[in-house]
Interface confidence: low
């Protein structure tokens, strides 16, 4: 999906009002310096691409993020503020239902959500122009 035409300010508002707090709740009890940020993004569409990938694509050691509160709110925000996003997700959601596993908060999931926090921070902070 090409995130270029999303309403970034509305997504930012959704993040600041709710998604950020859900991410913090998920990470509660974890030190902010425990994980190094290894994933980054260069502009808002790129950030959303990375955020979608980390939030909804199961990875080795962490298959359970898609049903977390922050993930559902992320999905809702993208569906509302990114034209055509919902349609592209129908097939992906069908496939995910078939392989959903028991919800377990692993250290790998915590690391992945820490990366997500970093990506959201970058999304919310358009880079200053280089002078």
């Amino acid at each position: 999906y090409d995130f270029t035409n999303c309403d970034f300010e509305k997504i930012k508002a959704a993040y600041l009002s709710t998604i950020s707090k859900d991410l913090i709740t998920y990470m509660s009890g974890t030190k902010s310096t425990e994980f190094n940020n290894t994933v980054s993004c260069s502009n808002r569409p790129h950030c959303l691409t990375e955020i979608q990938s980390l939030t909804f694509n199961p990875t080795a050691g962490c298959a359970s993020l898609a049903k977390e509160m922050f993930a559902m709110k992320t999905k809702a925000a993208l569906a509302i503020w990114c034209p055509g996003y919902s349609e592209t997700q129908i097939n992906a959601t069908q496939a995910m239902k078939k392989r959903r596993k028991r919800k377990v908060t692993t250290n790998k999931c915590l690391e992945q959500v820490s990366q997500l926090q970093g990506l959201w921070r970058r999304f919310n902070r358009p880079l200053l122009k280089q002078q």
């Epitope: 310096t33 190094n36 980054s40 921070r121 970058r122 902070r125 200053l128």
Partner: antibody, heavy 121, light 105 residues
Framework: EVQLVQSGAEVKKPGASVKVSCKAS????????MNWVKQAPGQRLEWIGI????????SYNQKFKGRATLTVDKSASTAYMELSSLRSEDTAVYYC??????????????WGQGTTVTVSS | EIVLTQSPATLSLSPGERATLSCRAS?????MHWYQQKPGQAPRPWIY???NLASGVPARFSGSGSGTDYTLTISRLEPEDFAVYYC????????FGGGTKVEIK
């Protein structure tokens, strides 16, 4: 624990330049902006400028544009503020201050201890 | 540039009294931050985004306001509250107010 440790006091002659450093630790240096703030003796806080360690992008207070230069060394997690063509009114304490967007606002949540720069002939 | 004007410049009060500090912006801002500074020390974040107390700040402090007018209130002054308080905005670059010194009467 987030810490910003600044370089020591400097005494400079008018017309010279000074470069103040600010070593960051306890967080991912490239995640947050770094501000520089001036405080002349008995005076208000005065914003100099801001830099994004992620890409080196900067924004300056018009008053300091052309004389202040903000840079970073990502590998050393260190921010720098260089002030050129010094004059007596540049005598002040200079602070670096990390800026984060906690509480839905971009606030300066951690400050260095300050570097005193004295300009005197 | 948005200019922030703090009043009064100096507030002379006794411990136990109520303190009201004002910060007025030359044009509307989204919200205001407040910092406390004591002699020889760096400023410390005190109130974030108009009304959120920074970590460790006592509940006797509160912040309010919108648009161009913002207020920091101390319900009952304690000896450790005597300091200079600065407001700061970032809606248009970053600017600080001139500060209000809260001193013991």
């Amino acid at each position: 624990e987030v810490q910003l440790v600044q370089s020591g006091a400097e005494v400079k002659k008018p017309g010279a330049s000074v470069k103040v450093s600010c070593k960051a630790s306890g967080y991912t240096f490239t995640d947050d902006y770094m501000n520089w703030v001036k405080q002349a003796p008995g005076q208000r806080l005065e914003w100099i400028g801001i830099i994004s360690p992620y890409n080196g992008g900067t924004s300056y207070n018009q008053k300091f544009k052309g004389r202040a230069t903000l840079t970073v060394d990502k590998s050393a997690s260190t921010a720098y503020m260089e002030l050129s063509s010094l004059r007596s009114e540049d005598t002040a304490v200079y602070y670096c201050a990390r800026e984060d967007y906690d509480y839905d606002g971009y606030a300066m949540d951690h400050w260095g201890q300050g570097t005193t720069v004295t300009v005197s002939s | 540039e948005i200019v922030l004007t703090q009043s009064p410049a100096t507030l002379s009060l006794s411990p136990g009294e109520r303190a009201t500090l004002s910060c007025r912006a030359s044009s509307s801002v989204s919200y205001m931050h407040w910092y406390q500074q004591k002699p020889g020390q760096a400023p410390r974040p005190w109130i974030y985004a108009t009304s959120n107390l920074a970590s460790g700040v006592p509940a006797r402090f509160s912040g309010s306001g919108s648009g161009t007018d913002y207020t920091l209130t101390i319900s009952r002054l304690e000896p450790e509250d005597f300091a200079v308080y600065y407001c700061q905005q970032w809606s248009s670059n970053r600017t600080f107010g001139g500060g209000t010194k809260v001193e013991i009467k």
